[in-house]
């Protein structure tokens, strides 16, 4: 999906919110300088690449961030503030039901959201270009 | 083990510029987050800004847009923080104080003093 | 900005003591705050972070409580290297902002 048409502002707003207290509530316990930052993004659309891949595709020692409440709030910002972004999901999403596992927090899926914290501050950056 | 090692304290004009340095040690310099809080006497601390030392990018405090400047020096793995226009209520302690994406500060300099006075 | 209303300002005690010190935020920080310990000429200390979690080396007398808008700091039996400056901060949002200290001294 290409986020260049999204409504950077709304879901900015949407992060203020909501989403930045919902990964603030997951990151509970964890220490400061316990995670380097890895990822990086250079404007809003590959911010938002970087977000959606990090959230919603499995990695090795994180099963799956998507049933957290960060993530469901973060898919229906995109599905109401970029145009055509749900319809690409439709698949996505019946995947996901298939592998659908119990939740836990693992060390892993804490540095993943650690690294969600850093690109949604880089996301939230009043001047960062939006191409 | 990270430690934060500041400059001496300045003694100032009002209307003059300070700036404070930040060497750090004992880390990668670029996984963390460099921020600058101050203490005036009998004052809350006051949180002034940030720094990302993977890009230079800076967050300030609306109080201070516009006098403050925080920079890097990447090869010194150094962080300076400049105020300008000083009156004599920026007569503080200013500290320099490390985080990860998580804004708790557990590593601190350990302060430098500056006075305002004509 | 988020403010966070710290009290009581000045407090007296004896070493031994249980005192509690409590800090309001303006609207809700989760459980996003840490509190310090300054004394004199020095630099702030991290106490407790999560509201609640110890900080590497700090002494099981002190406990932190609370979410949302209060949070308490506790102290469960004063001994004579805890009279100090305290301070609570908020990290839930930017900006960060701490409270203005409660200054326990010895009575």
């Known amino acids: 999906y290409d986020f260049t048409n999204c409504d950077f502002e709304k879901i900015k707003a949407a992060y203020l919110s909501t989403i930045s207290k919902d990964l603030i509530t997951y990151m509970s316990g964890t220490k400061s300088t316990e995670f380097n930052n890895t990822v990086s993004c250079s404007n809003r659309p590959h911010c938002l690449t970087e977000i959606q891949s990090l959230t919603f595709n499995p990695t090795a020692g994180c099963a799956s961030l998507a049933k957290e409440m960060f993530a469901m709030k973060t898919k229906a910002a995109l599905a109401i503030w970029c145009p055509g972004y749900s319809e690409t999901q439709i698949n996505a999403t019946q995947a996901m039901k298939k592998r659908r596992k119990r939740k836990v927090t693992t060390n892993k899926c804490l540095e993943q959201v650690s690294q969600l914290q850093g690109l949604w501050r880089r996301f939230n950056r009043p001047l960062l270009k939006q191409q | 083990q990270v430690q934060l090692v500041q400059s001496g304290a300045e003694v100032k004009k009002p209307g003059a510029s300070v700036k404070v340095s930040c060497k750090a040690s004992?880390?990668?310099?670029?996984?963390?987050?460099m921020h600058w809080v101050r203490q005036a006497p009998g004052q809350c601390l006051e949180w002034m800004g940030e720094i990302d030392p993977s890009d230079s990018y800076t967050d300030y405090n609306q109080n201070f847009r516009g006098r403050v400047t925080i920079t890097v020096d990447m090869s010194a793995s150094t962080a300076y923080m400049e105020l300008s226009s000083l009156r004599s209520e920026d007569t503080a302690v200013y500290y320099c104080?490390?985080?990860?994406?998580?804004?708790?500060?557990?590593?601190w300099g350990q302060g430098t003093l500056v006075t305002v006075s004509s | 900005d988020i403010q966070m209303t710290q009290s009581p300002s000045f407090l007296s005690a004896s070493v031994g003591d249980r005192v509690t010190i409590t800090c309001k935020a303006s609207q809700d920080v989760v459980t996003a705050v840490a509190w310090y310990q300054q004394k004199p000429g020095k630099a702030p200390k991290l106490l407790i972070y999560?509201?609640?979690m110890r900080h590497t080396g700090v002494p099981s007398r002190f406990s932190g409580s609370g979410s949302g808008t209060e949070f308490t700091l506790t102290i469960s039996s004063l001994q004579p290297e805890d009279f100090a400056t305290y301070f609570c901060?908020?990290?839930?949002?930017?900006?960060?902002?701490f409270g203005c200290g409660t200054k326990l001294e010895i009575k």
């Open positions: 004992g880390y990668t310099f670029t996984s963390y987050l």
């Open positions: 901060q908020q990290y839930s949002s930017f900006t960060f902002t």
């Open positions: 104080a490390l985080t990860g994406t998580i804004n708790y500060f557990d590593y």
């Open positions: 999560w509201a609640s």
